[in-house]
Interface confidence: medium
């Protein structure tokens, strides 16, 4: 079942999926001046069996000027740099995301693809948020949103995240910057902080995405 809407937007934050559930579609979009080849796929589809998932179909773009030329898809490193996707640059990609049952990894780029990727997510998909550069999170822990089905309708849970500009902080003379107390910040949780410079989603998180160890809504 496809999710009706996109994941919620959070001010000064972006989101990414660590892996894509089977049934997810990715539009075959081409950058300006290029178009899909005739008889080319409209989208890529994450499909699979019990042991392996992969993307069906290939996206292929050709110059709008040339009608009959077809270019074979070969991932270009420079294209990767140019792409603006929904994903964030994270210092540590979960190494086992591809082995998560029923999920596909991020598809490789195709030649002349559009600068932004448009995904169509399915129920059960989870995405993770982080503040953009220059902003910091006021909550601890991974901010995530899950597409859920309730009463026959799909909805994304609201991620717990506030991103505020560092210039907005008000510290006054004599007002010390408090240290987090040991009770307030257990050692085991420090690597899960969502900050502007640190989005370290641990590999074990990817393995537990289906039954997330973190609650999206705290009630």
């Amino acid at each position: 079942e496809l999710c009706d809407d996109d994941p919620p937007e959070i001010p000064h934050a972006t989101f990414k999926a660590m892996a894509y559930k089977e049934g997810t579609m990715l539009n075959c979009e081409c950058k300006r001046g290029f178009r899909r080849i005739k008889s080319g796929s409209l989208y890529m589809l994450c499909t699979g069996n019990s042991s392996h998932s992969s993307w069906d179909n290939q996206c292929q773009c050709t110059s709008s000027a040339t009608r009959n030329t077809t270019k074979q898809v070969t991932p270009q490193p420079e294209e990767q740099k140019e792409r603006k996707t929904t994903e964030m640059q994270s210092p540590m990609q979960p190494v086992d995301q591809a082995s998560l049952p029923g999920h596909c990894r991020e598809p490789p780029p195709w030649e002349n693809e559009a600068t932004e990727r448009i995904y169509h997510f399915v129920v059960g998909q989870m995405v993770y948020y982080q503040c953009v550069q220059g902003y910091r999170a006021l909550h601890r822990g991974p901010a995530e949103s899950v597409c859920k089905m309730t009463h026959g309708k799909t909805r994304w849970t609201q991620p717990q995240l506030i991103c505020t500009g560092e210039m907005e902080t008000s510290q006054f003379p004599g007002e010390e910057k408090p240290q987090a107390s040991p009770e307030g910040r257990p050692e085991s949780e420090t690597s899960c902080l969502v900050t502007t410079t640190d989005f370290q989603i641990q590999t074990e998180m990817a393995a537990t995405m289906e039954t997330s160890i973190f609650t999206t809504e705290y009630q």
Partner: antibody
Framework: QVQLVESGGGVVQPGRSLRLSCAAS????????MAWVRQAPGKGLEWVAV????????YYADSVKGRFTISRDNSKNTLYLQMNSLRAEDTAVYYC?????????WGQGTLVTVSS | DIQMTQSPSSLSASVGDRVTITCRAS??????LNWYQQKPGEAPRRLIY???SLQSGVPSRFSGSGSGTDYTLTISSLQPEDFATYYC?????????FGQGTKLEIK
């Protein structure tokens, strides 16, 4: 069940100080940003201050900057608002709220009256 | 600071009526807008977040729309329990700000 209970309100003279407390339960307090919102009698709502989960980042409305200090004690699941140099215009019901994107859960508020 | 202006300031309507309250921001708030309901002596209750997402447990007669600087809260068929004061609130940048409120009264 999330519960936020404010206390510490009362009548105080202009220029004096008061400290409000908010006892939180029903969620992992130390993971969440918290905020104070106030409402003058018969008037609208105003965000006063917000604090990050660990107390390291604080944000204030211009109207209280330099006079009010927001703080928290995660070991006691308690949020505080220290109000100094109080003015008549600070008279309001002060609400404690979970501060993420929304003001999702609120306490019932505590009334602060600044009057000579 | 971003100023939020609601209209009308007060409104009289009858049970069953369709009611619309508007909220205008002094600059774009990029759909980062909440709507709250407040009854006398009670804390505010969030109805809608992100312009049009209904808070869990809120009746479907409430809906929100808008973009940029202009936003709307619609109650499709007023119920007796809907008579209250409604506030919009932006959360795109600190300080987050509320509209001055719209008091919805029984005609």
């Amino acid at each position: 069940q999330v519960q936020l209970v404010e206390s510490g309100g009362g009548v105080v003279q202009p220029g004096r100080s008061l400290r409000l407390s908010c006892a939180a339960s029903g969620f992992t307090f130390s993971n969440h940003a918290m905020a104070w919102v106030r409402q003058a009698p018969g008037k609208g709502l105003e965000w006063v201050a917000v604090i990050s989960y660990d107390g390291s980042n604080k944000y204030y409305a211009d109207s209280v900057k330099g006079r009010f200090t927001i703080s928290r004690d995660n070991s006691k699941n308690t949020l505080y608002l220290q109000m100094n140099s109080l003015r008549a215009e600070d008279t309001a019901v002060y609400y404690c709220t979970t501060g993420w994107n929304s003001g999702y859960d609120w306490g019932q508020g505590t009334l602060v009256t600044v009057s000579s | 600071d971003i100023q939020m202006t609601q209209s009308p300031s007060s409104l009289s309507a009858s049970v069953g009526d369709r009611v619309t309250i508007t909220c205008r921001a002094s600059q774009s708030v990029s759909s980062f807008l909440n709507w709250y309901q407040q009854k006398p002596g009670e804390a505010p209750r969030r109805l809608i977040y992100g312009t049009n997402s209904l808070q869990s447990g809120v009746p479907s007669r409430f809906s929100g729309s808008g973009s940029g600087t202009d936003y709307t809260l619609t109650i499709s068929s007023l119920q007796p329990e809907d008579f209250a004061t409604y506030y919009c609130q932006q959360y795109t940048s600190w300080p987050w700000t509320f509209g001055q409120g719209t008091k919805l009264e029984i005609k």
